[in-house]
Interface confidence: low
Amino acid sequence: CEEPPTFEAMELIGKPKPYYEIGERVDYKCKKGYFYIPPLATHTICDRNHTWLPVSDDACYRETCPYIRDPLNGQAVPANGTYEFGYQMHFICNEGYYLIGEEILYCELKGSVAIWSGKPPICEKVLCTPPPKIKNGKHTFSEVEVFEYLDAVTYSCDPAPGPDPFSLIGESTIYCGDNSVWSRAAPECKVVKCRFPVVENGKQISGFGKKFYYKATVMFECDKGFYLDGSDTIVCDSNSTWDPPVPKCLKVLPPSSTKPPALSHSVSTSSTTKSPASSASGPRPTYKPPVSNYPGYPKPEEGILDSLD
């Protein structure tokens, strides 16, 4: 027989020879870091057909590292479910806690003993410092100095000194997030007031009022013989401007060979409309506008346009 087989967990006793006689026996021992559990054989014999009789290193077991209990508010997860040397222990904290220390420990061999590569980490509670104070406003729990994971505060605006109130711009409620950072920026309190929206040849059909504050919404329609250039719905935004801009009501041109046909009915609807000149952020059109020679518009069929798709 040629040299006997080699194994991960056991090694030959004595030096290997270039060849062995039939019937010659070789013995193995468990390698450093492995220990023997009977009764499996750890020897083999050179057989008549010049091969070694079957033998395995299944009797040699890896040394294991000491048991590690789960950290408080977390988990210790052995890779491959084993504590044997050469493997790793992974540490995960529960939601609302973060890891202090090594996320992974290695089970390592020191001499013939298996020990962990370091100290197990701990799981600390996620804490946030107080959220930012805002001008012209305040938040709940302003007296609290330390906030825990998912603790929430709600902002509100102070009464305004003048005739117009402060509006809250942004989300009113924020919470302590899992990386000890508040879930979003604090909102803003400021006076937001949009100018009275005037549309010539048209009229306001909703959102009536004398003053238009943050998020005030107004809808328009055009008088008979006029069509809407822009959005029929506008909202007062945080910069005290209308978004999209205040629309216009343009006159429907009379029919001719190069001009679109006049409509026999008023082109106005409470559903949203949009022309090529209107803001791209506005709502989508729900009817075909009566202009065939503007870029991007469909040509009228047989001189008649339906007011609705």
């Epitope: 997860v77 890779a79 491959n80 040397f85 050469g86 493997y87 790793q88 992974h90 995960i92 996320e103 992974i104 290695y106 390592e108 061999l109 990386n179």
Partner: antibody, heavy 116, light 109 residues
């Protein structure tokens, strides 16, 4: 200056062997896990092997297990990759890299071409 | 085929924001193992960009950020610049094996 300087690449026939070296400066390799990562021409990164900081633990990708051996010489502050029974599909740029879970320092890479 | 799945390519104009996704499974990212990101500029070695899901090594601009949820992770790049054109790889771990995504080529238009 903290760096990894690689050597040992070249053209080799299938079935032959080659040894790559990666010399560290500015830090000692026996304080860190060290890896080999490869990149076939025009392809993505593939992890090859790792050796733990004390040299006791070595892991290999299935594609190289039994053919490649990772080792280090602490006296020379150098990492090695012994590549035996090379195949055409082992053709790649081989990078050595420092670190455990992630690789925060990379060598410049050395090209290994396996061709008859 | 990579165990971690990335889109082969993404693109964006200068100044824009782009995100690159990385999808794993319950045995790697979903098991709680960290996700790391590498940038590889043409003809150079990879460079660590994000480690431990969302940490930046010193010298990496804060335009780069990482996040992770469930079995997926993503890299976000804001204020895109011409020099960001490169290949980006996500990386994670499963017992005894370090994993890479297939890589995503970022083109700055």
């Amino acid at each position: 200056q903290v760096q990894l300087v690689q050597s040992g690449g070249g053209v080799v026939q299938p079935g032959r062997s080659l040894r790559l070296a990666c010399a560290a400066s500015g830090f000692t390799v026996n304080n860190y896990a060290m890896h080999w990562v490869r990149q076939a021409p025009g392809k993505g990164l593939e992890w090859v092997a790792v050796i733990s900081y004390d040299g006791n633990n070595k892991y290999y990708a299935d594609s190289v297990k039994g053919r490649f051996t990772i080792s280090r010489d602490n006296s020379k502050n150098t990492l090695y990759l012994q590549m035996n029974s090379l195949r055409a599909e082992d053709t790649a740029v081989y990078y050595c890299a420092k670190g455990g879970g992630y690789f925060d320092l990379w060598g410049r890479g050395t090209l290994v071409t396996v061709s008859s | 085929q990579s165990v971690l799945t990335q889109p082969p390519s993404v693109s964006g104009a200068p100044g824009q924001r782009v995100t690159i996704s990385c999808t794993g499974s319950s045995s790697n990212i979903g098991a709680g193992y960290d996700v790391h990101w590498y940038q590889q500029l043409p003809g150079t070695a990879p460079k660590l960009l994000i480690y431990g899901d969302n940490n930046r090594p010193s010298g990496v601009p804060d335009r780069f950020s990482g996040s992770k949820s469930g079995t997926s992770a993503s890299l976000a790049i804001t204020g895109l610049q011409a020099e960001d054109e490169a290949d980006y790889y996500c990386s994670s771990y499963t017992s005894g094996t370090w994993l890479f995504g297939g890589g995503t080529k970022l083109t700055v238009l």
